[in-house]
Amino acid sequence: QTDPELTIMTRLGQVQGTRLPVPDRSHVIAFLGIPFAEPPLGKMRFKPPEPKKPWNDVFDARDYPSACYQYVDTSYPGFSGTEMWNPNRMMSEDCLYLNVWVPATPRPHNLTVMVWIYGGGFYSGSSSLDVYDGRYLAHSEKVVVVSMNYRVSAFGFLALNGSAEAPGNVGLLDQRLALQWVQDNIHFFGGNPKQVTIFGESAGAASVGMHLLSPDSRPKFTRAILQSGVPNGPWRTVSFDEARRRAIKLGRLVGCPDGNDTDLIDCLRSKQPQDLIDQEWLVLPFSGLFRFSFVPVIDGVVFPDTPEAMLNSGNFKDTQILLGVNQNEGSYFLIYGAPGFSKDNESLITREDFLQGVKMSVPHANEIGLEAVILQYTDWMDEDNPIKNREAMDDIVGDHNVVCPLQHFAKMYAQYSILQGQTGTASQGNLGWGNSGSASNSGNSQVSVYLYMFDHRASNLVWPEWMGVIHGYEIEFVFGLPLEKRLNYTLEEEKLSRRMMKYWANFARTGNPNINVDGSIDSRRRWPVFTSTEQKHVGLNTDSLKVHKGLKSQFCALWNRFLPRLLNVTENIDDAERQWKAEFHRWSSYMMHWKNQFDHYSKQERCTNL
């Protein structure tokens, strides 16, 4: 006999879940591996997902689904620091499933919903990782937690413009379809479809930002949390031309003959998934740190324009956002190729390695651009100091790829709350759902921005000390893992985790991290709104809440203002100079030819053929 608490009728059919224990001798109910799309197999590879068709039997949703096909990091096969991010389930193209954790309250009703989107550079990630276990957050904050798998790498982001067979961005469309599933079904699980916060980290946060920008995604959720990622910035999107170049290169690498788009896609579909994964890194045009092969593409559909242009014009969802960064966003990426860096030593960096590393970190910059970066990040009284060179590299990679794009995103969002506040009243703690339109066309803006800097290094971290507070290592605190005694966190870390879960859930419920479930506000520890002028943000660590102003403003002025302009101006100079040299060469050849002809003519004794 089936337990009614564990069996739920959804729009598509019945699903059976399971009870999972949580630390205080209680439990949550989990539905793991619910299908939300038809398996994207065969002809469906590279194509947008199709909604799952109904089923008749009870669907067994008691265990995590397969992970989507992806590159696996085998750099250190015996090291949990890398292994924790690798898929812990078999990989398959049949991977479009989602998970739901429901607090074990009697008949949960209209609970706030938090939907997690994993990161992994758009080339990796899976919803089944231990660090994304939704049970602790669901139980502690009485919210419904959802996470989904989405296609990554070429399977999710291979794009050939003009082709319905591989339009690109299908991994984002997988996420959107899961959000639609939540709208259609979450009330069966006691969740409120009008109170859905999407949250993610790194490429997952970039995805969250993309749904804030993408007009067709905006109505499918209420609010957004972005952890160490935004949709703008150097690695998150490519042009259609670049996406096409990479698709063609992948075809060549796996032995597909040159031909038209249809032939190429048919050939790529005939290959084993692992064949595509094995070649994916080789399609990059240059080797750089924090660069990934198959990422979202500016397609004119999912993205009407570039994220930068949409941000600048206020073309984004009018709602509240909470976002932030970790103290050492760059360190993780340095050990994957920057000269002199290793997790297995102190990574004391020579000046020569530093200069080489800067080149790898900003691969699109010309000489003068690199010089600007070096100038900004060098202590010229101590330029050979190996510790300072190491820390500068950490800052360069982190600021360029995470911190400064996020600061820009926050400022653009906050700026529109001011602009709209002048034509209406900005509502900072609004409990409503926000409109699904743009910030720029709403006289009564609901935009408010909350920003954090996470700067606590976990006591049980397996990575070396010099790597600091690493990219991705706030996630375990957001998901409440420190509540699990066997994981060896300190009591202070458990308290920090409880605080962070409360902030995140308060924000999801009300749009304000300070407003508790009962409506009270802890006046001693108030997290202020981030504005584009003051840029107030909080430090999240085991100390009491501290408010800071300006998030790396000096450094972000380089990345967000000066460097783009410098490259724009000097790139034009370089182009003009190249063009001038080519023209001059042609002109010289012509003049030489003319001179020879004239010399020949002048040597003639008399004019002929007159």
Epitope: V72, Y76, P77, G78, F79, S80, Q274, D344, V462
Partner: antibody, heavy 125, light 106 residues
Framework: EVQLVESGGGLVQPKGSLKLSCAAS????????MHWVRQAPGKGLEWVAR??????????HYADSVKDRFTISRDDSQTMLYLQMNNLKTEDTAMYYC????????????????WGQGTSVTVSS | QIVLTQSPAIMSASPGEKVTMTCSAS?????MYWYHQKPGSSPKPWIY???NLASGVPARFSGSGSGTSYSLSVSSVEAEDAATYYC?????????FGGGTKLEIK
């Protein structure tokens, strides 16, 4: 059946060179990381070098004791693994094993799951 | 580099006895691997990832441990278990082996 067969060992003078080969069969060679491990007479095991697969850009790692003297390489089309040993020293005298690293999809992931019979290298004047 | 120290270097046991050998790491590692080698033969994988027995390894063997301290145990030793056992870590480069524990059967 997985097979690893080493060859190329022998007697060589100090400062001399030698190239070891390992013929692999019975598995999809190009998807596996491969290693050389050595064992001096009557002593324990010492890891020498690792080469990863093409999807990992054939990245290599070496033990400090052989760095800048030994070079590990592979030829996926011939399913061959090589170890080029230059500037040999007497302390390089050992049995050299060609070893496969278990792949992510195997239960043996991360372990040295198949070993050849070894080829003996003696460095002596 | 991480140094692995195995103890004892040599141990002797009678058939049916329980034996335990240890492997101590100079800094914390996530997993330990164990190999078994008989004289004149190549090493064979014995225990994967701290506690998973390789195929064909008798159930009387077990592995355990965490952090810097790991062990391999045999619940009831048999004559065929005489061999040298090596621990190995792959937590960081360079990969390292312990010096080995030689198990002799009386």
């Amino acid at each position: 059946e997985v097979q690893l067969v080493e060859s190329g060992g022998g007697l060589v003078q100090p400062k001399g060179s030698l190239k070891l080969s390992c013929a692999a069969s019975g598995f999809t060679f190009n998807t596996y990381a491969m290693h050389w491990v050595r064992q001096a007479p009557g002593k324990g095991l010492e890891w020498v070098a690792r080469i990863r697969s093409k999807s990992n850009k054939y990245a290599t790692h070496y033990a400090d004791s052989v760095k800048d003297r030994f070079t590990i390489s592979r030829d996926d089309s011939q399913t061959m693994l090589y170890l080029q040993m230059n500037n040999l020293k007497t302390e390089d005298t050992a049995m050299y094993y060609c070893v496969r690293e278990g792949s992510y999809y195997d239960s043996s992931y991360g372990a040295m799951d198949y070993w050849g019979q070894g080829t003996s290298v003696t460095v002596s004047s | 580099q991480i140094v692995l120290t195995q103890s004892p270097a040599i141990m002797s046991a009678s058939p049916g006895e329980k034996v335990t050998m240890t492997c101590s790491a100079s800094s914390s590692v996530s997993y330990m691997y164990w190999y078994h080698q008989k004289p004149g033969s190549s090493p064979k994988p014995w225990i994967y990832r701290t506690s998973n027995l390789a195929s064909g390894v008798p159930a009387r063997f077990s592995g355990s441990g965490s952090g810097t301290s790991y062990s391999l145990s045999v619940s009831s030793v048999e004559a065929e278990d005489a061999a040298t056992y090596y621990c190995q870590q792959y937590n960081s480069h360079p990969m390292t082996f312990g010096g080995g524990t030689k198990l002799e059967i009386k």
